[in-house]
């Protein structure tokens, strides 16, 4: 067990703050909730506290939640290559680039850290050449989300991990929305982190309404599991 | 454009596509007698590139997002330089995310003919 992962035993309030600007609509999203890496449960809720928000909320989904990826839960065999984790309490920086197909982009950074028991995703999104009718800006998404795998690797040059998904957003026209995830995490401290075998996160997430909540929000219930590493041949003999 | 050995060159060239559709941009020379090649890629997510071994310490690849445009600086020329310049943009093949050498290249530039004399 990492030293960090032992901070992940029991239920961790999470706290998230974004503040975005996409095509210079500016907006901000406070997020308060909790999670459960025995579990890899997530239970969130997001208001937007300016007012209403510019984007669809579930283009943000990846940037809240995807966000805290500490909370995945690594079966035993797959411990040994969870990043995320390792890098508590210190935590880690998460740089994403988000395209959207035939339409504008997503920039985001985020420190992910402990503050006191609280773990904390503060992020910064910078949103440029969107359509002003587009998908996003049009508000065309269906507020839901579809299941996705998120495919890691270790990035030994910068003592961290890649990641690359690819996000099918469903449109009210019974389209789809491709958006693709190129993500890099880099430890803030200077302690020991797991790098890595190639595997991906298997992820389940549903978003609801709080039917006494008149601010525009977002109810998040998500579950992340790791897996695409096998048990190796001493496991099998045992 | 034409330069002498140990002059410098700056190519640019602008895509239309969208940022999905050209997550890597890169520059390709065909010069005499050989088959195209891969002079330097750029990964547009964060600026990750690649450099031919004859062109490492020479040549530098960048891009500017908001205009949609690749650059490549080229210094201390040499003959065997010479070439037409071709620039391309695409995505990464399936499996390879982070990998623009070997992208599948959609749009390809018209060229431009870089001379180096002696």
């Known amino acids: 067990m990492s030293k960090g992962e032992e901070l992940f035993t029991g239920v961790v309030p999470i706290l998230v703050e974004l503040d975005g600007d996409v095509n210079g609509h500016k907006f901000s999203v406070s997020g308060e909730g909790e999670g459960d890496a025995t579990y890899g449960k997530l239970t969130l809720k997001f208001i937007c506290t300016t007012g209403k928000l510019p984007v669809p909320w579930p283009t943000l989904v990846t940037t809240f939640s995807y966000g805290v990826q500490c909370f995945s839960r690594y079966p035993d065999h797959m411990k040994q290559h969870d990043f995320f984790k390792s890098a508590m309490p210190e935590g880690y920086v998460q740089e994403r680039t988000i395209f959207f197909k035939d339409d504008g982009n997503y920039k985001t950074r985020a420190e992910v850290k402990f503050e006191g028991d609280t773990l904390v995703n503060r992020i910064e999104l910078k949103g440029i050449d969107f359509k002003e009718d587009g998908n996003i800006l049009g508000h065309k998404l269906e507020y839901n989300y579809n299941s996705h795998n998120v495919y890691i690797m270790a990035d030994k040059q910068k003592n961290g991990i890649k990641v690359n998904f690819k996000i099918r957003h469903n449109i009210e026209d019974g389209s789809v929305q491709l958006a693709d995830h190129y993500q890099q995490n880099t430890p803030i401290g200077d302690g020991p982190v797991l790098l890595p075998d190639n595997h991906y996160l298997s992820t389940q997430s549903a978003l609801s309404k709080d039917p006494n909540e008149k601010r525009d929000h977002m109810v998040l219930l998500e579950f992340v599991t790791a897996a695409g590493i096998t048990h190796g041949m001493d496991e099998l003999y045992k | 454009g034409s330069v002498q050995t140990g002059g410098s060159l700056g190519l640019s060239c602008t895509t239309s596509l969208d940022g999905y559709s050209s997550v890597c941009m890169g520059w390709f020379r065909q010069t005499p007698g050989k088959e195209r090649e891969g002079v330097a890629t750029i990964h547009r997510a964060f600026g990750d590139t690649y450099y031919a071994d004859s062109v490492k310490g020479r040549f530098t690849i960048s891009e500017d997002s908001a205009k949609n445009t690749v650059y490549l600086r080229m210094n201390s020329l040499k003959p065997e330089d010479t070439g037409m310049y071709y620039c391309?943009?695409?995505?990464?093949?399936?499996?390879?995310?982070?990998?623009?050498?070997?992208?599948?290249?959609?749009?390809w530039g018209q060229g431009t003919q870089v001379t180096v004399s002696s």
């Open positions: 391309a943009a695409g995505r990464p093949k399936s499996g390879s995310a982070w990998n623009c050498r070997d992208a599948e290249y959609v749009y």
